[in-house]
């Protein structure tokens, strides 16, 4: 049952959520499957029901506690298993011993807001959500700005190599509509990846004053 054609990937949001995706070619569509979490040094177990996200891929979120509670530490190892029902029993389809702080993906930054906007500049701030206090200041950010007539994929990435929850965008065009997104990544963890992009923040630069270039 546990074989190489199965891919089982999970990330920890650093607080109280482990999100998992399991994909397997030829897996039964109408079988009930779940992810089971068994920490090595905790008294709790947790399960979540895998729900289809595509033809051969399923996902679920293990909710370990209140969103801001610190449920796991850097020394924890969690045995994660994909279990699929066969009759009255559950077959192990995939298994991994998961080091949470080696497999981090934080929640997208929230509360984006325009602090100050001018004709050519805009100062934007944001907050990180459900991020562990263990990181202290060991976080980095990427930001991108959507200009008129372009796509997000074409937007150049701005890198902030420190925990800086604001940015001053410069060389903007007056009286122009823009959108802005940011994402976050801890410096810790061999398999750590970027958070999802934040919800876009729309803003408009101020029009240039007549006869002036501000």
């Amino acid at each position: 049952a546990v074989n190489g054609t199965s891919q089982f990937t999970c990330f920890y949001n650093s607080r109280a959520n482990i999100s998992c995706v399991w994909s397997q070619d030829g897996a039964l569509q109408d079988t009930s499957c779940q992810v089971h979490a068994w920490p090595d040094r905790r008294r709790w177990n947790q399960t979540c029901e895998l729900l289809p996200v595509s033809q051969a891929s399923w996902a679920c979120n293990l909710i370990l506690g209140a969103p801001d509670s610190q449920k796991l530490t850097t020394v924890d190892i969690v045995t994660l298993r994909v279990l699929c029902r066969e009759g009255v029993r559950w077959r192990v389809m995939a298994i991994q011993d998961f080091k949470p702080f080696e497999n981090l993906r934080l929640m997208a930054p929230i509360s984006l807001q325009v602090v100050h906007v001018e004709t050519h500049r805009c100062n934007i701030s944001w907050e990180i959500s459900q991020a562990s206090h263990y990181f202290e200041r060991h976080l980095e950010f990427e930001a991108r700005t959507l200009s008129p007539g372009h796509t997000w994929e074409e937007a150049p990435l701005l890198t902030l190599k420190q925990k800086q929850e604001w940015i001053c965008l410069e060389t903007l065009t007056p009286d122009t509509q823009y959108e802005f997104q940011v994402r976050v990544k801890p410096l810790q963890g061999e398999f750590t990846t970027w958070s999802p992009w934040s919800q876009p923040l729309a803003f408009r630069t101020k029009p240039a004053a007549l006869g002036k270039d501000t």
Partner: nanobody, 117 residues
Framework: QVQLAESGGGLVQPGGSLTLSCVAS????????MAWYRQAPGKMRELVAS???????VYADSVKGRFTLSRDNTKNTVYLQMNSLKPEDTAVYRC???????????WGQGTQVTVSS
Amino acid sequence: QVQLAESGGGLVQPGGSLTLSCVASGSILEMSRMAWYRQAPGKMRELVASITSIGSIVYADSVKGRFTLSRDNTKNTVYLQMNSLKPEDTAVYRCNALGTWSDETYWGQGTQVTVSS
């Protein structure tokens, strides 16, 4: 019902070595994962090292580079080679096997490892 029997524990000086063995009464190829756990008095149980049926090995950070996990499928045995032992490695070491089914969790009785001068 799979039986697990550990051996190889004992008293060793700091910096010394031991090899623990875990022999299964059934085929370890039918196990989804084999692992060694340890528990020191008054401490929480912790996973030391594990190997899945597809060969993925994980080590606790505290033993990485000092301990080596291996298996011999023909002998249905899993080994834990422990080098550069430290007093904090003192614990009861227990072998664990997880089967093909969710209700198949097997434990050995454990073997005592004491690191002391």
